[in-house]
Amino acid sequence: GITIPRNPGCPNSEDKNFPRTVMVNLNIHNRNTNTNPKRSSDYYNRSTSPWNLHRNEDPERYPSVIWEAQCRHLGCINADGNVDYHMNSVPIQQEILVLRREPPHCPNSFRLEKILVSVGCTCVTPIVHHVQ
Amino acid sequence: GITIPRNPGCPNSEDKNFPRTVMVNLNIHNRNTNTNPKRSSDYYNRSTSPWNLHRNEDPERYPSVIWEAQCRHLGCINADGNVDYHMNSVPIQQEILVLRREPPHCPNSFRLEKILVSVGCTCVTPIVHHVQ
């Protein structure tokens, strides 16, 4: 059978739980400096479905700061600058990977976790349910 | 600064690069048990700034498939269903973490990487630059 060539530069794992517990290099490749979404664009203010950004901070998680969007209105902003309730502001959500310290407070031991975050809001036509 | 209390049950790290290289349990914990992000919506079709989802695939990355939003129009859909070019459809971007094997083919060594993805689109009022 084909075996994966063992790279001599691979760290050796003595862990009995292998392959579930592995070494992860946190020296992030492609480190984008702008992590605060307010700095990257002002869409959250200019959108017809504007949102506020809330700082979600957790020292037991990496990244420790995640920005969560909350739509400002149920409706959307119309051309007159008023809220139109015939349309809906809704959050766009995405599942992301984070690392959580496990056991808690361990500086160098984590678990991979998937969490759902709201990234921004968009304006949608509502689904109308007709009464039979 | 705040120091994390040392938990006696923590795995010990002899790594000189600590805290850049950490132990991670890869048995993914999913916190989204009640809200499945895939099921969440057909907002991409119902939005006034609709978008298409394009597959970004990389077999050496986890997740291997990431969906990228591309706004369908430069403008936004108005109440008549037409594109209004006085408004702009713009992508909402987010930085996410992915895992990459490093060195390649090492079964127990990974590197965290940040990538920027477009999650969806929102409709914004354009910035008008007045000519002096």
């Epitope: 579930r20 | 499945n36 895939k38 919506s41 991409y44 989802l53 990389d58 077999p59 291997s64 969906w67």
Partner: antibody, heavy 117, light 106 residues
Framework: QVQLVQSGAEVKKPGSSVKVSCKAS????????ISWVRQAPGQGLEWMGS????????NYAQKFQGRVTITADESTSTAYMELSSLRSEDTAVYYC??????????WGQGTLVTVSS | DIQMTQSPSSLSASVGDRVTITCRAS??????LNWYQQKPGKAPKLLIY???SLQSGVPSRFSGSGSGTDFTLTISSLQPEDFAVYYC????????FGQGTKVEIK
């Protein structure tokens, strides 16, 4: 080109277990999951569960919880599906498939498991 | 579990015909719907993913549409090699398949 090659047909007695293998050739498992899907004679397709070989993370369909075990050996690029407490209604073709967590894009050729006393 | 209901369960058509198969989900699944083709004694083959995206190598006569709960697979001009069973599958939640649609020669 990814190819998934499965082990041969099996005949088993009710109450016993079967272990089917699925070997990825022409490449490693990469970061995809491997899912197992079965098809009883003349019937439709039924998802049983999956594993992400990179991580060892498994996910099982509720119907098979406790009776199916999916494992993977990265050194040989092989995934395994073991089904225990076999009954006649488990007679089916068992497929492994590469799973992006959105669709199944490469399938094994299938393994017929016959449960008969 | 999300139930997937295909219709019709079988259809007879001639080479060159336009064929439409529908699939309905028991709840909204956004666009997380795939279509597969299966020939006798063979494994299924992915045709369409994410409701409307054509898998590479699949002829352009196959197309998919729909969103939410109602989806359609269309074969614009049926070819002799298209006679097979077609399955829809959702991946909004743990995967489930439709019961299949058999496309037979008229």
């Amino acid at each position: 080109q990814v190819q998934l090659v499965q082990s041969g047909a099996e005949v088993k007695k009710p109450g016993s277990s079967v272990k089917v293998s699925c070997k990825a050739s022409g490449g490693t498992f990469s970061s995809y999951a491997i899912s197992w899907v079965r098809q009883a004679p003349g019937q439709g397709l039924e998802w049983m569960g999956s594993i992400i070989p990179w991580f060892g993370t498994t996910n099982y369909a509720q119907k098979f919880q406790g009776r199916v075990t999916i494992t993977a050996d990265e050194s040989t690029s092989t995934a395994y599906m073991e089904l225990s407490s076999l009954r006649s209604e488990d007679t089916a073709v068992y497929y492994c498939a590469r799973d992006s967590e959105y669709y199944f894009d490469h399938w094994g050729q299938g393994t017929l498991v016959t449960v008969s006393s | 579990d999300i139930q997937m209901t295909q219709s019709p369960s079988s259809l007879s058509a001639s080479v060159g015909d336009r064929v439409t198969i529908t699939c309905r989900a028991s709840q909204g699944i956004s666009n997380w719907l795939n279509w597969y083709q299966q020939k006798p004694g063979k494994a299924p083959k992915l045709l369409i993913y994410a409701a409307s995206s054509l898998q590479s190598g699949v002829p352009s006569r196959f197309s998919g549409s729909g969103s939410g709960t109602d989806f359609t697979l269309t074969i614009s001009s049926l070819q002799p090699e298209d006679f097979a069973v077609y399955y829809c599958q959702q991946y909004s939640d743990d995967p489930t398949f439709g019961q299949g649609t058999k496309v037979e020669i008229k």
